[in-house]
Interface confidence: medium
């Protein structure tokens, strides 16, 4: 005989667990329905009635199947200098990220409390390690035979062009100057850029049944002038 499909609420067999999208209610001692993302449990189940779900109110959300009594609050509004990369909906938290060219320098579970501008490597220095969402650019002096003539958070040191006859030798902050009309080998025109950091932050999720304790909202703090670091500029 085919197994009967049990409808919630139902008492589970001893030693068995409730099915997907169901939870075991300790009070009713029954398997009951979870609420879908964007909803929460308005009335918990009993032995004779299933969970009653209701939609999340404005500015609140649930991202997973759940049986939480109230939806989670979306994180604080993004500040004026931030980018809202994900809006607050009934099914997802708001995500704010530091604007391009900035990184998160001070954070708590709630998100980024301090966005700071990425360090710019000054002429004679190139990017050794690009900035990420949570780390600053690392600059390094251009090695012999390479140069950087820009103040940039993305440019690396580039090789000097090789001349048939050198008019002015290159140094760490200037390319070589050739006397002939064209060098034997040169880099493509324009600076070599490292890509800007791409957000890799994934949305925090809330475990079931407990609400998430880590909304992934970032926050921006207006910056004062940064003191220039070695090989970098605060400009």
């Amino acid at each position: 005989l085919p197994a009967q499909v049990a409808f919630t609420p139902y008492a589970p067999e001893p030693g068995s667990t409730c099915r997907l999208r169901e939870y075991y209610d300790q009070t009713a001692q029954m398997c009951c329905s979870k609420c879908s993302p964007g909803q929460h449990a308005k009335v918990f189940c009993t032995k004779t009635s299933d969970t009653v779900c209701d939609s999340c109110e404005d500015s609140t959300y649930t991202q997973l199947w759940n049986w939480v009594p109230e939806c989670l609050s979306c994180g604080s509004r993004c500040s004026s200098d931030q980018v809202e990369t994900q809006a607050c909906t009934r099914e997802q938290n708001r995500i704010c990220t530091c604007r391009p060219g900035w990184y998160c320098a001070l954070s708590k579970q709630e998100g980024c409390r301090l966005c700071a501008p990425l360090r710019k490597c000054r002429p004679g220095f190139g990017v050794a390690r690009p900035g990420t969402e949570t780390s600053d650019v690392v600059c390094k002096p251009c090695a012999p035979g390479t140069f950087s003539n820009t103040t940039s958070s993305t440019d690396i040191c580039r090789p000097h062009q090789i001349c048939n006859v050198v008019a002015i030798p290159g140094n760490a902050s200037m390319d070589a100057v050739c006397t002939s009309t064209s060098p034997t080998r040169s880099m493509a025109p324009g600076a070599v850029h490292l890509p800007q950091p791409v957000s890799t932050r994934s949305q925090h999720t809330q475990p079931t049944p407990e609400p998430s304790t880590a909304p992934s909202t970032s926050f921006l703090l207006p910056m004062g002038p940064s003191p220039p670091a070695e090989g970098s500029t605060g400009d």
Epitope: S76, K108, R113, A116, L221, P222, G234
Partner: antibody, heavy 120, light 111 residues
């Protein structure tokens, strides 16, 4: 305008617990932290911890971990600080304060304070 | 924990004169060009009141005779021309890392 109104004075016996409330108004309660600070008579300020009401996340001074419990009720915009296993040295005025998540990152509005006296 | 040490413990200044309070942190309270150091004023029977945030920013409604300066571990609160209503205890506080910590306070009186 931002206002934090705390519950009234309490007298407790050693070993008991006390729960102080802090009702917020004039801003979005779930957007900012509520910090708790205490001050013994004639003494300086001591940070107990903070709660982010939007998520319930808490951060405690290690000195108070296990004895202090910070909670918040979003529906009535009220934060609570419960201190257990009270001893005479816990006699102090307890303040709640708002700290913005971004911007100042300082406690810019304070409650009026709640005097907790621990005496046998 | 970051330990905050204020000096002096008390200060008597004539009306209209300059008052200077120092605060030293046991380690830097700076991060990416911002100093997470704040100054509060507390009068008897009242809660503390924020005067200066992030080392040098004047809180809204605070008279401009109050100013803050410093970076790293050493900070100063200055009252350019002391008024009678400035008699109070002043505290520095860091919020760079948990636990947030306060200085022991400096009592300012009229000479």
């Amino acid at each position: 305008q931002v206002q934090l109104v705390q519950s009234g004075a309490e007298v407790k016996k050693p070993g008991a617990s006390v729960k102080v409330s802090c009702k917020a108004s004039g801003y979005t309660f779930t957007d900012d932290y509520i910090d708790w600070v205490r001050q013994a008579t004639g003494q300086g300020l001591e940070w107990i911890g903070e709660i982010y009401p939007g998520s319930g996340n808490t951060y405690y001074n290690e000195k108070f971990k296990g004895r202090a419990t910070l909670t918040a009720n979003k529906s009535i915009s009220t934060a609570y600080m419960e201190l257990s296993s009270l001893r005479s040295e816990d006699t102090a005025v307890y303040f709640c304060a708002r700290s913005q998540v971004y911007g100042k990152i300082a406690m810019d509005h304070w409650g009026q304070g709640t005097l907790v006296t621990v005496s046998s | 924990d970051i330990v905050m040490t204020q000096s002096p413990d008390s200060l008597a200044v004539s009306l209209g004169e300059r008052a200077t309070i120092n605060c030293r942190a046991s380690e830097s309270v700076d991060n990416s060009g911002n100093s997470f150091m704040h100054w509060y004023q507390q009068k008897p029977g009242q809660p503390p009141k924020l005067l200066i945030y992030r080392a040098s920013n004047l809180e809204s409604g605070v008279p401009d005779r109050f100013s803050g300066s410093g970076a790293g571990t050493d900070f100063t609160l200055t009252i350019s021309s002391l008024q009678a209503e400035d008699v109070a205890v002043y505290y520095c506080q860091q919020s760079k890392e948990d636990p947030y910590t306060f200085g022991q306070g400096t009592k300012v009186e009229i000479k």
